[in-house]
Interface confidence: medium
């Protein structure tokens, strides 16, 4: 809503941005606060309890001063005035400093990611060209689910070096398509680590691991827990032998019984010989009966 243009009353012209302004009516703020003064003293606004509608006036003044978008010197000090910005406003900005990003994320801390924040992050990441480690560190600190909100295409711009910033909880809501993109990057990032350390780091990315990597892990006494196993790709688990799964899970193999009706365990059981399943001594049922011939139909389809 436009604030009526009225002359500033005598003696009310603002010499600086200070607490006295909270007692100004909206039209007085419009008439008595110079936009250039506001821009140079933006850092003070955050400490002054302006009302919701007084902030509309201050925003309007900045919009008039910077119709092409605010400079970063102003953006960095927006404070809670940021909550008044629309995604359209933010698309005009060029935010390059991580400090600016942190300052604005701090304002929204504890809330869901708003459209404004999503736009801000998008502008920042696009400006940098890739999601570097420092940025990822910052974003996942404020929004643990951030990584999993990106599309597989966006994730492809994450350099392997950034994977070191990822914590297990950051991947909690990722789907298999996202893990398919992240797993090879993690494998590359952690390739110089020794067996047990490598497994600790790679574990939360294994939902994107292919069969051959799972076979290799089964040779390393990793003792994968059932929660991790249940998140593996079904197509990666199916070709594993009973012996390989037993080695992969170690003492956790007993947990298969409780999961025998759930994927990928259910589908894996259907592919195993019942004889082999019986060697586990867990009472797993549903394997291929003894004496039956197993045909690999996938090979036949590939040939026809």
């Amino acid at each position: 809503r436009e604030v009526e243009k009225t002359a500033c009353p005598s003696g009310k012209k603002a010499r600086e941005i200070d607490e006295s302004l909270i007692f100004y009516k909206k039209w007085e703020l419009e008439a008595c606060v110079d936009a250039a003064l506001l821009a140079t003293q933006m850092d003070r606004v955050n400490a002054i309890p302006f009302t919701y509608e007084q902030l509309d006036v201050l925003k309007h003044k900045l919009d008039e001063l910077y119709p092409q978008g605010y400079p970063e010197s102003v953006i960095q000090h927006l404070g809670y005035l940021f909550l008044k910005m629309s995604p359209e406003d933010i698309r005009k900005w060029n935010v390059t400093s991580l400090e600016t990003l942190k300052a604005l994320l701090e304002v929204n801390k504890g809330h869901e990611m708003s459209p404004q924040v999503a736009t801000l992050i998008d502008r920042f990441v696009k400006g940098r060209g890739q999601l570097d480690k420092d940025t990822l560190d910052t974003l996942t600190a404020f929004y643990p689910g951030y990584l999993c909100s990106l599309s597989p295409e966006e994730l492809s711009s994450v350099p392997p070096s950034s994977i070191w910033a990822v914590r297990p909880q950051d991947l909690d809501t990722c789907d298999p398509r996202q893990l398919d993109v992240l797993y090879p990057k993690a494998r590359l990032a952690f390739q110089n680590m020794n067996g047990s350390e490598y497994f600790v780091k790679i574990q939360s990315f294994l939902g994107g691991a292919p069969t051959e990597d799972l076979k290799a892990l089964s040779q390393q006494n990793v003792s994968m827990d059932l929660a991790t196993f249940m998140k593996l790709r079904t197509d990666a688990v199916l070709p594993l032998t009973v012996a390989e799964v037993q080695k992969l899970l170690g003492p956790h193999v007993e947990g298969l019984k409780a999961e025998e009706r759930h994927r990928p365990v259910r589908d894996w059981i259907l592919r195993q010989r019942q004889d082999d399943l019986d060697t586990l001594g867990l009472g797993l049922q549903g394997g291929i009966p003894n004496g039956y011939l197993v045909l690999d139909l996938s090979m036949q389809e590939a040939l026809s």
Epitope: K25, P49, T51, Y80
Partner: nanobody
Framework: QVKLEESGGGLVQPGGSLRLSCAAS????????MAWFRQAPGKEREIVAV????????YYAESVKGRFTISRDNPKNTVYLQMNSLKPEDTAVYYC????????????WGQGTQVTVSS
């Protein structure tokens, strides 16, 4: 319409403490600035403390700086005034107020709670 109800007032000795509460009802006040005003007998109503709608910015009258603290709990629609090191001159009726506009227009008021500082 916003309804404001103050509580927590009473008689206290000089140097003592009180915590005033103001519960808002009728609509959420998360986008409103909240304030405490006071009016001593024979004097004009004066502003004591203000907190903005995010809980970030605060303002205190010079006479209470360092002694009083204003805070808010948006989910509970409540604002508080913690008053420490009370002095006899703090004796007044304390009013809670809310506005989205400015303190000189469109302000909602509570009924007030009496604070008496006396030995």
């Amino acid at each position: 319409q916003v309804k404001l109800e103050e509580s927590g007032g009473g008689l206290v000795q000089p140097g003592g403490s009180l915590r005033l509460s103001c519960a808002a009802s009728g609509r959420t006040v998360s986008a409103y600035n909240m304030a405490w005003f006071r009016q001593a007998p024979g004097k004009e109503r004066e502003i004591v403390a203000v907190i903005n709608w995010t809980g970030g910015g605060t303002y205190y009258a010079e006479s209470v700086k360092g002694r009083f603290t204003i805070s808010r709990d948006n989910p509970k629609n409540t604002v508080y005034l913690q008053m420490n090191s009370l002095k006899p001159e703090d004796t007044a009726v304390y009013y809670c107020a809310a506005t989205r506009t400015s303190w000189t227009e469109n302000t909602y008021w509570g009924q007030g709670t009496q604070v008496t500082v006396s030995s």
